[in-house]
Amino acid sequence: MMTGTIETTGNISAEKGGSIILQCHLSSTTAQVTQVNWEQQDQLLAICNADLGWHISPSFKDRVAPGPGLGLTLQSLTVNDTGEYFCIYHTYPDGTYTGRIFLEVLESSVAEHGARFQIP
């Protein structure tokens, strides 16, 4: 039975040209996290294997940096980066947990962080 929950940074906004940290945290389970994948819509941005480390997709290596922790840093943001991002936790023995973050990249300087929320 999957008992864990993923807490994410929720709906967030950031300024064009700036950076943003995408963060997820898995709690309420003793399952072993074996790998965390970061995806944007249908594209794989990065893999963080618990033993074998971080691997950034060549398509994103210039604008994506690993961390902090299991999070992901997006740099040099453009309005095209607006959209859904997913953290996918591969765990043993529970299976897969998925968290969702919506990022809006704004032209102006009115970007503010949204509230945290949980996905079971």
Partner: antibody, heavy 119, light 107 residues
Framework: QVQLQESGGGLVQPGGSLRLSCAAS????????MSWVRQNPDKRLELVAT????????YYPDSVKGRFTISRDNAKNTLYLQMNSLRAEDTAMYYC????????????WGQGTLVTVSS | DIVMTQSPKTLSASVGDRVTITCKAS??????VSWYQQKPGQSPKLLIY???TRHTGVPDRFSGSGSGTDYTLTISSLQAEDVALYYC?????????FGGGTKVEIK
């Protein structure tokens, strides 16, 4: 250049134990996660164990979980695989492997050590 | 676990031929795929990672492509030294699993 040299293979009876070693050189061993990959007589490849750079995290597939233990001695630049309760289906060539730097794939492999489980 | 199904199991072609090996994943692996070559009596050698990035020193006659569940390794002009077993591997989900292999022979 990166070199990985396995040893410790041999013939063992079902239910027996064996400890494989992999001597690493040519890179900073303590900075890299390491893996054991085996190739059975039908030439199928299977990743059987991984360990992080400091030895604090390990992973095993269900096929070997509870029977195999991966460990490392960073002072000796050596990777180990302790194999207990061996079965006929564990018969394989065992390779020590390392990912390339910034490479999602095993760029470095040893020459392998053969483990035969038979009565 | 994700199952990687390679085809064909054996491929016989002439020197200079264009050769294609396919790998089908049991679920979307989003380009987290690598390809290896194993010559007789040798250890596997990395050819391609992230589905299409050629590893250092790999001849440019080797190329990889694909997305979703379907991936391809192409040898644009088969050479005698390309006789080997070829394997795909997925890194999308643990355990990282390999395909069953394709044996490439010269006609």
């Amino acid at each position: 250049q990166v070199q990985l040299q396995e040893s410790g293979g041999g013939l063992v009876q079902p239910g027996g134990s064996l400890r494989l070693s992999c001597a690493a050189s040519g890179f900073t061993f303590s900075s890299y996660g390491m893996s054991w990959v085996r190739q059975n007589p039908d030439k199928r490849l299977e990743l059987v164990a991984t360990i992080n750079s400091n030895g604090g995290s390990t992973y095993y597939p269900d096929s070997v979980k509870g029977r195999f233990t991966i460990s490392r001695d960073n002072a000796k630049n050596t990777l180990y695989l302790q194999m207990n309760s061996l079965r006929a289906e564990d018969t394989a060539m065992y390779y020590c492997a390392r990912l390339g730097t910034g490479t999602l794939g095993f760029a470095y492999w040893g020459q392998g050590t053969l483990v035969t489980v038979s009565s | 676990d994700i199952v990687m199904t390679q085809s064909p199991k054996t491929l016989s072609a002439s020197v200079g031929d264009r050769v294609t090996i396919t790998c089908k994943a049991s679920q979307d692996v989003k380009t987290a795929v690598s390809w290896y070559q194993q010559k007789p009596g040798q250890s596997p050698k990395l050819l391609i990672y992230w589905a299409s990035t050629r590893h250092t020193g790999v001849p440019d006659r080797f190329s990889g492509s694909g997305s979703g569940t379907d991936y391809t390794l192409t040898i644009s002009s088969l050479q005698a030294e390309d006789v080997a077993l070829y394997y795909c591997q997925q890194h999308y989900s643990t355990p990282w699993t390999f395909g069953g292999g394709t044996k490439v022979e010269i006609k």
